[in-house]
């Protein structure tokens, strides 16, 4: 129809100008469209320069929409991480404060002379929780060994106890069980509780990290062309009122976000494992019960040592020989009264239950984040047509969209009619993030069984790759032991984004 050839470009001028582009580019009326490289080559209101500007703009708008969606998810994960971290740190800090307040009165010099050893233990526990590559069982064993040496010397000031005698004492210690059942109980419970707490918080950190890194993956040129066609070609072709057909939009975005959808399986596995590990937060070996009650095990241990002092001394002398008596030394230390114990089971505060139920709900809500992303962006950002009728924009004209909707993920885009996707070239950043999810899931599964995956001889994640940028200070490289200097693989992730809490000045 010759009349339609000279249609005015007023509506396009308005839209183009509103986007901040110069109106001098816009023709007054439609022109022939042989110059168009993305949009169908009918009569058009777009010059080559306009087409290029709108293509760049549509690309940027999709990246912004993608980042916005990711930011919401990241913010949720960061809030969860902060809440749980605050709670776990609070439990440990509370325990240490209780120890500092009650032990001087309960144990006198047996505590004050060893305050540094107790402070160090809490620092080590804090570091372990925050992702330092230290062996918790070894750290606890070393604490008890050092404490035994010091307390034995204090309880026997009348004896000369040179280093070689103390070395012998250390070798006898395991058989003598000087602190009763407390060290074993604390080791079993603390290992399970701290492993569960730290792996859960690490899981939140890794999930957040993955979302952040994936949001930075650039969209390829084929995607840019398809999005331009989806969003702005209708304007160029003189049907600015036509909204994209829903299935057309889904195919474009499934093609654009094919690699992202491949995160789905491992993302679900990670979130499932995180929900599962929260079961370990309850009961007598649960996080709240154990982390908040470290001081009660320590009190029990010192009481046991005092109660067993005479038997212990006899056995040590039997194994290590008679130590020399210091002629000017005082008599043996008076037996102190037993330190009063707080009840071992902390009554649950309700805070953790609330945190866990919120976390479970939110983690379930975002389980299908990656595969629902195309649909979400289409419905929230693309001003879709309300129905798949013949009045929507199908990429060529106003009309019905006939192709079927593609499946999710890279492999399913082989016949995507809207985006040319090379299914043989997966995005490497996203593959690395899939590996990070796998490693973290493996860590959570081990933690569920009470094992610290970083200190198992045969780590089955098979990979040391990954960003590793979650490490604080030099936590990930450090080993703590004066008896051994192991060289196990450092953590791939410590806890990202947590505040420094060690290395504080004290006087």
């Amino acid at each position: 129809d010759p009349a339609s050839k000279s249609r005015s470009c007023g509506e396009v001028r308005q839209i183009y100008g509103a986007k901040g582009f110069s109106l001098s580019d816009v023709p007054q009326a439609e022109i022939s469209g042989e110059h168009l490289r993305i949009c169908p080559q009918g009569y058009t209101c777009c010059t080559s320069e306009m087409e290029e500007n709108l293509a760049n703009r549509s690309h940027a708008e999709l990246e912004t929409a993608l980042r916005d969606s990711s930011r919401v998810l990241q913010a949720m994960l960061a809030t969860q991480l902060r809440s749980f971290d605050d709670h776990f740190q609070h439990l440990l800090n509370d325990s240490e404060r209780t120890l500092q307040a009650t032990f001087p009165g309960a144990f006198g010099e047996l505590y004050t002379q060893n305050a540094r050893a107790f402070r160090d233990l809490y620092s080590e526990l804090r570091l372990y929780y925050r992702g330092a590559n230290l062996h918790l069982e070894e750290t606890l064993a070393e604490f008890w060994a050092r404490l035994l040496e010091r307390l034995f010397k204090q309880l026997h000031p009348q004896l000369l106890l040179p280093d070689d005698y103390l070395d012998c004492l250390g070798k006898q210690a395991e058989a003598l069980r000087p602190f009763g059942e407390a060290p074993r109980e604390l080791r079993l419970r603390a290992t399970r509780a701290f492993v569960a707490a730290r792996s859960f918080v690490q899981g939140l950190g890794v999930a957040s990290d993955v979302v952040r890194k994936v949001a930075q993956v650039p969209l390829g040129p084929e995607c840019s062309r398809a999005v331009m066609k989806l969003v702005y070609c209708a304007h160029c072709l003189g049907v600015p009122g036509a909204r994209p057909c829903p299935d057309y939009c889904r195919n474009v975005l499934k093609g654009c976000l094919a690699n992202q959808a491949d995160l789905d399986a491992e993302w679900r596995n990670l979130l499932d494992s995180m929900v599962l590990i929260t079961d370990k937060f309850w009961g007598t070996s649960g996080v709240e019960s154990v982390i908040g009650s470290v001081h009660t095990w320590l009190a029990e241990a010192i009481n046991a040592l005092q109660d067993n002092r005479d038997t212990l001394t006899a056995k040590v002398i039997q194994g290590c020989g008679n130590p020399k008596v210091n002629p000017q030394g005082p008599g043996p230390e008076e037996k102190r009264r037993r330190g009063k114990l707080a009840p071992r089971e902390r009554p649950p505060s309700g805070t953790l239950e609330k945190l866990v139920s919120e976390a479970k709900a939110q983690l379930r809500d975002v389980q299908d984040f990656w595969i629902s992303l195309p649909g979400t962006l289409c419905s929230e950002k693309m001003a879709l047509s309300t129905a798949s009728d013949d009045r929507c924009w199908n990429g060529m004209a106003r009309g019905r969209y006939l192709p079927e909707v593609m499946g999710d993920g890279l492999a399913n885009q082989i016949n995507n009619p809207e985006v040319e996707v090379d299914i043989t070239k997966p995005d490497m950043t996203i593959r690395q993030q899939i590996m990070q999810l796998k490693i973290m899931t493996n860590r959570l599964r081990s933690a569920y069984n009470g094992n610290d995956v970083d200190f198992q001889d045969a780590s089955d994640d098979g990979s040391g790759s990954g960003s590793g940028d979650g490490c604080l200070d030099d936590l990930c490289s450090r080993k703590v032991s004066r008896k051994s200097s192991s060289s196990r693989t450092p953590l791939t992730h410590a806890l990202p984004g947590l505040s420094e809490q060690e290395g504080q000045k004290t006087s």
Partner: antibody, heavy 119, light 107 residues
């Protein structure tokens, strides 16, 4: 065998800062506290503070608390002592010293670092 | 802080002499007292820890005794290598403190 090797002598102006290093070898670095002790010319020994190389926790002598910072780098088994707002009376030999076992007894000493503060 | 007082501040003695150095503390430190030897231009060396334990490798002519607030370092037969300054130090509490030193000179 245990060795503590300190950085070389320094000459500083009043008001400046100095950072002395102490590289440890021959034992598990994170297993023992490290202390800093100084000795002014012709004077006695003065304890400045300690650091736990495992955790980075520090305890300072109140006298130096506002001016001293002790840090460690576990990757190089090195501890550092930084003293700021130097004055002429800070001219001294600064020693790092490692504990014998967990006991506050200084069994191993660095060779010392002479810091001279002069305008 | 615990104040450490050594006496004498210096002494002159001959090879073969028996030498005793005293260290007193401003409060009880039980047996947490250590002795160091320092030669000019060198770092101190640990001799005795926990009041009376001889560090491995230190000659047996050195001995230590005492408890509470009063301690003694004894060199049973002074040797040429023993002319140096000796310091006591408490490891009972923080801040760690040293005595002012006792210089042992050749008579």
């Amino acid at each position: 065998q245990v060795q503590l090797v300190q950085s070389g002598a320094e000459v500083k102006k009043p008001g400046a800062s100095v950072k002395v290093s102490c590289k440890a070898s021959g034992y598990t670095f994170t297993g023992y506290y490290m202390h800093w002790v100084r000795q002014a010319p012709g004077q006695g020994l003065e304890w400045m503070g300690e650091i736990n190389p495992s955790t980075g926790d520090t305890t300072y002598n109140q006298k130096f608390k506002a001016r001293v910072t002790m840090t460690r780098d576990t990757s190089t088994s090195t501890v550092y002592m930084e003293l700021s707002s130097l004055r002429s009376e800070d001219t001294a030999v600064y020693y790092c010293a490692r504990e014998k076992r967990d006991d506050g007894v200084f069994a191993y000493w660095g060779q010392g670092t002479l810091v001279t503060v002069s305008s | 802080e615990i104040v450490m007082t050594q006496s004498p501040s210096s002494l002159s003695a001959s090879v073969g002499d028996r030498v005793t150095i005293s260290c007193r503390t401003s409060q009880t430190i039980r047996h947490y007292l250590n002795w160091y030897q320092q030669k000019p231009g060198k770092a101190p060396k640990l001799l005795i820890y926990d009041a009376s334990n001889l560090k491995t490798g230190v000659p047996s002519r050195f001995s230590g005794s005492g408890s509470g607030t009063s301690f003694t370092l004894t060199i049973s037969s002074l040797q040429p290598d023993d002319f140096a300054t000796y310091y006591c130090q408490q490891s009972y509490s923080t801040p760690r403190t040293f005595g002012q030193g006792t210089k042992v000179e050749i008579k």
